[in-house]
Interface confidence: low
């Protein structure tokens, strides 16, 4: 039986956002598998003409932190930190609205790209959201 655990990020695709910080993984094999999948997703994004600069500036780090969430150092058991719901919603509904609509209607993109469901994230004022991962989207401040 394998529990989730925390390990240093060893990948390349998200290194500029995560560095070698500790991320939460759900099995020994998971980090390598996710690295392969997110690399393929980023390759696809790079060739897309549908991604605006204002969206990609925050969508790329957001996807990295969703794929490789920081470990919650305040928890006594290995636990991932969530993305912040307010930023997630601004990304989906404002900065990347067109891109999300396109992505969700395109099966090929959905196969490669795992988009966060903002409704699954803790409410901003809840205790669970106190330690959420903030990307730094200006409109959320």
């Amino acid at each position: 039986e394998e529990d989730g655990f925390c390990q240093p990020y060893r990948g390349i695709a998200c290194a500029r956002f995560i560095g070698n910080r500790t991320v939460y993984m759900e099995s020994l094999h998971m980090q390598g598998e996710i690295e392969n999948q997110i690399t393929a997703a980023f390759t696809m994004i790079g060739t897309s003409s549908h991604l605006s600069d204002k969206c990609s500036q925050f969508a790329i780090p957001s996807l990295c932190h969703y794929a490789f969430p920081y470990c919650d150092e305040t928890s006594s058991v290995p636990k991932p930190r969530d993305l912040c719901r307010d930023e997630c919603e601004i990304l989906e509904n404002v900065l990347c609205q067109t891109e999300y609509i396109f992505a969700r209607s395109n099966p090929m993109i959905l196969m490669r790209l795992k988009l966060p469901n903002c409704e699954d994230l803790p409410q901003p004022e809840s205790p669970e959201a106190a330690n959420c991962i903030r990307i730094g989207i200006p409109m959320a401040d």
């Epitope: 529990d3 989730g4 759900e26 598998e33 991932p80 969530d82």
Partner: nanobody, 111 residues
Framework: EVQLVESGGGLVQPGGSLRLSCAAS????????VGWYRQAPGKQRELVAR???????YYADSVKGRFTISIDNSKNTLYLQMNSLRAEDTAVYYC?????WGQGTLVTVSS
Amino acid sequence: EVQLVESGGGLVQPGGSLRLSCAASHYISRFYAVGWYRQAPGKQRELVARISSGGWTYYADSVKGRFTISIDNSKNTLYLQMNSLRAEDTAVYYCNARNLWGQGTLVTVSS
């Protein structure tokens, strides 16, 4: 406490398909490592497939390209679609969420 209940097992011919389901009594939070394990007679329990909160997947080499794991959060249900089944896939299949286990469902592949 969350309870896991598997279904969908049975007898199938080699090359056939089955879909296993694992219904959870509550929402399975992203803190769980959700997946399928199997145990063949006289063998150790082994990881078959796993899915993380973002839909990132892991498959054992022996099932890659044949099995597909998926999760429906709205139904609190985990699935394992098994195609091109082989005799060596015969086992009891268990749903797993961190330290929680279902009771298992028997899959028998035989002609």
